[in-house]
């Protein structure tokens, strides 16, 4: 019988979505491109459960990882790559003292147990997200 695989090989399934944690590093803009090339998006976080899952993945690997959040369009106004604004309830996830915009830090990363803003040109790991395949029928 045929087994259904909701996610591609080496992607992780969580609550109806598939996530790819990179093993190489790119700057923030190139991370967006890398996700687009595999039919996905640099991760946009929609719930507290999703945030907790992703933060755990990142901190477990002890890697600093780009997410799809920046204030490049308007300083201080944080926006996801799908155009949605950062909800006030999500501001609790910034590490203490962040975002601090030291030296034009306009892109957000998973940094240990919270979020940090850093320079978008820096090469870090990244996480892509796309909807899981339907296994019904």
């Amino acid at each position: 019988e045929r087994l259904c695989h909701p996610c591609p090989w080496e992607w992780t399934f969580f609550q109806g979505n598939c996530y790819f944690m990179s093993n190489s590093q790119r700057n923030w803009h190139d991370s967006i491109t890398a996700c687009q090339e595999v039919g996905a998006q640099l991760v946009v976080i929609k719930s507290a459960e999703e945030q907790n899952f992703l933060q755990l993945q990142s901190s477990r690997s002890n890697r600093f990882t780009w997410m799809g959040l920046s204030d490049l369009n308007h300083e201080g106004t944080w926006q996801w790559v799908d155009g949605s604004p950062l909800l006030p309830s999500f501001k609790q996830y910034w590490n203490k003292g962040e975002p601090n915009n030291v030296g034009e830090e306009d892109c957000a990363e998973f940094s240990g147990n919270g979020w940090n803003d850093d320079k978008c040109n820096l090469a870090k790991f990244w996480i892509c997200k796309k909807s899981a395949a339907s296994c019904s029928g």
Partner: antibody
Framework: QVQLVQSGAEVKKPGASVKVSCKAS????????INWVRQAPGQGLEWMGW????????NYAQKFQGRVTMTRDPSISTAYMELSRLRSDDTAVYYC?????????????WGQGTLVTVSS | DIVMTQSPLSLPGTPGEPASISCRSS???????????LDWYLQKPGQSPQFLIY???NRASGVPDRFSGSGSGTDFTLKISRVEAEDVGVYYC?????????FGQGTKLEIK
């Protein structure tokens, strides 16, 4: 593979300047800070500063402020460190090192070092 | 500036036996993100330094598993579970919490 290749040894007189180059290959030059670290003969490591190869922003140790200038040329993936008003105690091996912000601030690749001798 | 102090400065190692190096900082290296910004480097004779441990306790890729880092705040330790001849050199801890980044004085490991 990632490589940082530095310029050759230099002999300078006190009061002169020296400019050391660090040519990067095997990775995207603008994605990683380049740090400069020196080591006097038989001594430990001393951090001098860093440069962001993308923007050219620099951060120098107070000790070298006013005497050190770090620059870069992204078109040839090369960083430079110039130290002026040389003294005999500037005799050291000068290293460039790549700072990997995907792992905190780990210096994951180092150049082979450039010996600068300051002698009259 | 943060001052880093290593001990011992000289360490006679016996092949197959464990060895340990201590590193203390003049202020806590624990960042608000939960990581300790303390790295360990080894400089083998006649070579450039090479990385061993990052963020206090994480072994960098390619580093033998006989090397381990531990500690938090101001007190850190690098342990070699079984010393090998190729481990000789000078070991440095470095704080990267804030600039200027600062190194310990170095610990020279020699084989007995």
């Amino acid at each position: 593979q990632v490589q940082l290749v530095q310029s050759g040894a230099e002999v300078k007189k006190p009061g002169a300047s020296v400019k050391v180059s660090c040519k990067a290959s095997g990775y995207t030059f603008t994605g990683y800070y380049i740090n400069w670290v020196r080591q006097a003969p038989g001594q430990g490591l001393e951090w001098m500063g860093w440069i962001n190869p993308n923007s050219g922003d620099t951060n120098y140790a107070q000790k070298f402020q006013g005497r050190v200038t770090m620059t870069r040329d992204p078109s040839i993936s090369t960083a430079y460190m110039e130290l002026s008003r040389l003294r005999s105690d500037d005799t050291a091996v000068y290293y460039c090192a790549r700072e990997n912000s995907g792992y905190g601030k780990l210096f994951d690749y180092w150049g082979q070092g450039t010996l600068v001798t300051v002698s009259s | 500036d943060i001052v880093m102090t290593q001990s011992p400065l000289s360490l006679p190692g016996t092949p197959g036996e464990p060895a340990s190096i201590s590193c203390r900082s003049s202020q806590s290296l624990l960042h608000s993100n939960g990581y300790n910004y303390l790295d360990w480097y080894l400089q083998k004779p006649g070579q450039s330094p090479q990385f061993l441990i990052y963020l206090g306790s994480n072994r960098a890729s390619g580093v033998p598993d006989r090397f381990s880092g531990s500690g938090s705040g101001t007190d850190f330790t690098l342990k070699i579970s079984r010393v090998e001849a190729e481990d000789v050199g000078v070991y440095y801890c470095m704080q990267a919490l804030q600039t200027p980044y600062t190194f310990g004085q170095g610990t020279k490991l020699e084989i007995k």
